[in-house]
């Protein structure tokens, strides 16, 4: 018995070869002897039943001259798994067809952190092994059900599942979309008074995107968090539902989600959490955003530089006179210089020598007031 493996919805070719390598009479039948199709000597394909019943069955007329009389079954169904008989030159050849199906649980669009379950459906009597490879090259294998918990962004893409049965294999490709923001977290560094831009690009594209979202903000100076903005998303169009009066945020109506804050102020420095609930999906997408604000001031004989917001302890805050060595440099959120000499002073927030934020302040001779460029 020859074994042929097929995939549900696709086509399978069941072989039947003549020893004479020329056109001859042949008939394909089901195991219960019902006729499917054949050729009775006139080079014409004759079907065994009504067209609607047998429209999925065909042969390759171009191969007949070479002594090959395959049975082509299109749009395979699980119930096509059975034995087929090819009658040719007073002999019968049995071909066993096993149709397999691999499906993803409920949906192929899953939120980051959710689980993916791949299920193999196989015909009775078969004992296949299955191995699936993720887009990032991770292999998982098991029985009829394979599970991956805590899906990550890198799991988006084509999963390849190989079903092995009697040394024969059939490959399934399943496109999985992990719904997530491109970045889990981002940090924005701004001088006091500058405009602030927050962008929340999605890591996936879908034809129609509908849902609702909200940005909650925990200011460093505040005891509790506050909702800054709520919005709806319909077919990729953003419409603001409610926005706080302070700060007065602006939000773009096109994707990617984009917000602007008219100016960076110490009272806004802190952390935000943007959540997006998508229609027909359980759970929400999250992106954290952080705002660090710098202010340089001179009050009488004291030049001060301060930062507000979530800074790492390894960040260095420095005050230096332009083109000179730093006068003061500390792993703190405020530094100052008493009786600063006249000139352009720079306040720098840096991480391992890389400047993240810079604010300049001009110190005039003692009889004048300072100028902030």
């Amino acid at each position: 018995k020859t074994l042929v493996l097929g995939k549900e919805g696709e086509s399978a070719e069941l072989p039947c070869e003549s020893s004479q390598k020329k056109i001859t009479v042949f008939t394909w039948k089901f195991s219960d002897q019902r006729k499917i199709l054949g050729q009775h000597g006139k080079g014409v394909l004759i079907r065994g039943g009504s067209p609607s019943q047998f429209d999925r069955f065909d042969s390759k007329k171009g191969a007949w001259e070479k002594g090959s009389f395959p049975l082509i079954i299109n749009k395979l169904k699980m119930e096509d798994s059975q034995t087929y008989i090819c009658e040719l030159e007073n002999r019968k050849e049995e071909v066993e067809l096993w149709v397999f199906k691999v499906t993803a649980n409920s949906d192929t669009h899953l939120l980051q952190g959710q689980s993916l379950t791949l299920t193999l459906e196989s015909p009775p009597g078969s004992s296949p092994s299955v191995q699936c490879r993720s887009p990032r090259g991770k292999n998982i294998q098991g029985g009829k059900t394979l599970s991956v918990s805590q899906l990550e962004l890198q799991d988006s893409g084509t999963w390849t599942c190989t079903v092995l049965q009697n040394q024969k294999k059939v490959e399934f490709k399943i496109d999985i979309v992990v719904l997530a923001f491109q970045k889990a977290s981002s940090i924005v560094y701004k001088k006091e008074g500058e405009q602030v831009e927050f962008s929340f690009p999605l890591a996936f594209t879908v034809e129609k995107l509908t849902g609702s979202g909200e940005l909650w903000w925990q200011a460093e100076r505040a005891s509790s968090s506050k909702s800054w903005i709520t919005f709806d998303l319909k077919n990729k169009e953003v419409s603001v539902k409610r926005v706080t009066q302070d700060p007065k945020l602006q939000m773009g109506k096109k994707l990617p989600l984009h917000l602007t804050l008219p100016q960076a102020l110490p009272q806004y420095a802190g952390s935000g959490n943007l959540t997006l609930a998508l229609e027909a999906k359980t759970g929400k997408l999250h992106q954290e955003v952080n705002l660090v604000v710098m202010r340089a001031t001179q009050l009488q004989k004291n030049l001060t530089c301060e930062v507000w917001g979530p800074t790492s302890p390894k960040l260095m805050l420095s005050l230096k006179l332009e083109n000179k060595e730093a006068k003061v440099s500390k792993r703190e959120k405020a530094v100052w210089v008493l009786n600063p000499e006249a000139g352009m002073w720079q306040c720098l927030l840096s991480d391992s020598g890389q400047v993240l934020l810079e604010s300049n302040i001009k110190v005039l001779p003692t009889w004048s007031t300072p100028v902030q460029p």
């Epitope: 077919n235 169009e237 419409s239 602006q250 939000m251 773009g252 109506k253 602007t260």
Partner: antibody, heavy 119, light 107 residues
Framework: EVQLLESGGGLVQPGGSLRLSCAAS????????MSWVRQAPGKGLEWVSG????????YYADSVKGRFIISRDISKNTLYLEMNSLRAEDTAVYYC????????????WGQGTLVTVSS | AIQMTQSPSSLSASVGDRVTITCRAS??????LGWYQQKPGKAPKLLIY???SLQSGVPSRFSGSGSGTDFTLTISSLQPEDFATYYC?????????FGQGTKLEIK
Amino acid sequence: EVQLLESGGGLVQPGGSLRLSCAASGFTFSTNAMSWVRQAPGKGLEWVSGISGSNGNTYYADSVKGRFIISRDISKNTLYLEMNSLRAEDTAVYYCAKERDNWNGFDYWGQGTLVTVSS
Amino acid sequence: AIQMTQSPSSLSASVGDRVTITCRASHVIRNDLGWYQQKPGKAPKLLIYAASSLQSGVPSRFSGSGSGTDFTLTISSLQPEDFATYYCLQDYNYPYTFGQGTKLEIK
């Protein structure tokens, strides 16, 4: 071919009402965002009101909020602007404009209809 | 609402000149900006969308640039038919707002 044809303009007294219509053809009206833009004599362009194609949300300039109502009749492929409590400063040519598919500007405009508010 | 400040308000130039018009937004608007040309008694015409994309059928002498808050419309070599009034429009969010316009006249 895309066509936008405004009608309904005319002379109206201050405090009066008027309804402008814009008959649209040549594109999928039901899914397109549409707007009304006006131009007072000798002045610049002013965006007045818009309606979203995807969700039917309506939007207004502060100068007309509470007095004007934008709406659409998808079965008739027609956009409307209901103008109430009209003032002299509402005197302008009113244009109906179609937004590009992905909301990047107005790619088609009507010829405009003149609304004059005067006693 | 987002304010759009367009400059200059008027400009005199000659055929063949290179002309630049600028527009500044009061808020960051990404590249959500269009440029329009209007001739007397006519409806406006879209020239540039998404700050730098040329609308179909518009001559390549028109170009747009910029992102964030500062935008520019450039006409590389003025043609007689280019003398008109030009407007920028932010379509970042509602309410949309136009710049005050730049009247381009023959010197």
